[in-house]
Interface confidence: medium
């Protein structure tokens, strides 16, 4: 007969003979032959292979680097890859999360509208008419300005989006 | 100047206790998110925890995450690590760093000159 020029599926074509590709989690030993299947081994215990196959090798997991900031979120197995992502108060600086960077501080008169998460960074928002900030802060959020009459007292200094009100005592000498 | 000065670290057995101290200096200590970071011998920094400016807000890596409590006093522009349940893994140099706008990893711009933890039996 003919030899294939194409295989089915899972299969590849080898010496005009279609051989069957390992599965996921096993790398190639050995092509098969007219007599033989082809020959395959499990990955080793840090490797994996996440496709049908013919590699001689197998992938190593990817390594989280706690020095970037990094921790495993899910463990591989021998058909998948390490997952990373960064430590609670860093965020990912690319979608592969090779690395971690400090979420970023909102500066006084602005607070935080969404604390960061391990993918987005923070995201800042300027401090409306009647709430300030006084802080560099990645976490706090703007504040409400003192109300003053709640403690019977009246506003001595105005607040801005950076500063509390001052409160002081009321006037006595009211004609 | 920006100062902090750590102390109270020390020898500590296995399962002990230590509460480190930051002292700061030279800024507005309550205007900033503060953190701890450590240093094993012959390792690169880790990150340990952050502590928001108010101190509502408080982070940890995962090895410590219900040993160690930080926390601040604004009052006394003074910075704390409660360790407890102390691992031999947790032998460092334990140093506080003022949270800066922004930075990448191991590029701290304050520094003190760190408290040293040793576990051992």
């Known amino acids: 007969p003919e030899p294939p020029t194409a295989c089915r599926e899972k299969q590849y074509l080898i010496n005009s003979q279609c051989c069957s590709l390992c599965q996921p989690g096993q790398k190639l030993v050995s092509d098969c032959t007219e007599f033989t299947e082809t020959e395959c081994l499990p990955c080793g215990e840090s490797e994996f292979l996440d496709t049908w196959n013919r590699e001689t090798h197998c992938h190593q997991h990817k390594y989280c680097d706690p020095n970037l900031g990094l921790r495993v979120q899910q463990k591989g197995t021998s058909e998948t890859d390490t997952i990373c992502t960064c430590e609670e108060g860093w965020h990912c600086t690319s979608e592969a999360c090779e690395s971690c960077v400090l979420h970023r501080s909102c500066s006084p008169g602005f607070g935080v509208k969404q604390i960061a998460t391990g993918v987005s960074d923070t995201i800042c928002e300027p401090c409306p008419v009647g709430f300030f900030s006084n802080v560099s802060s990645a976490f706090e959020k703007c504040h409400p300005w003192t109300s003053c009459e709640t403690k019977d007292l009246v506003v001595q200094q105005a607040g801005t989006n950076k500063t509390d009100v001052v409160c002081g005592p009321q006037d006595r000498l009211r004609a | 100047e920006v100062q902090l000065l750590e102390s109270g670290g020390g020898l500590v057995q296995p399962g002990g206790s230590l509460r480190l101290s930051c002292a700061a200096s030279?800024?507005?200590?309550?205007?900033?998110?503060m953190q701890w970071v450590r240093q094993a011998p012959g390792r690169g920094l880790e990150w340990v925890s952050t502590i928001s400016a108010s101190g509502v807000y408080t982070y940890y890596t995962d090895s410590v995450k219900g040993r160690f409590t930080t926390s601040r006093d604004n009052s006394k522009n003074t910075l704390y690590l409660q360790m407890n349940s102390l691992r031999a893994e947790d032998t460092a140099v334990y140093y506080c760093?003022?949270?800066?706008?922004?930075?990448?990893?191991?590029?701290?711009?304050?520094w003190g000159q760190g408290t040293l933890v040793t576990v051992s039996s």
């Open positions: 030279g800024f507005t200590f309550s205007g900033y998110d």
């Open positions: 760093t003022k949270y800066p706008n922004r930075f990448a990893r191991n590029n701290f711009d304050y």
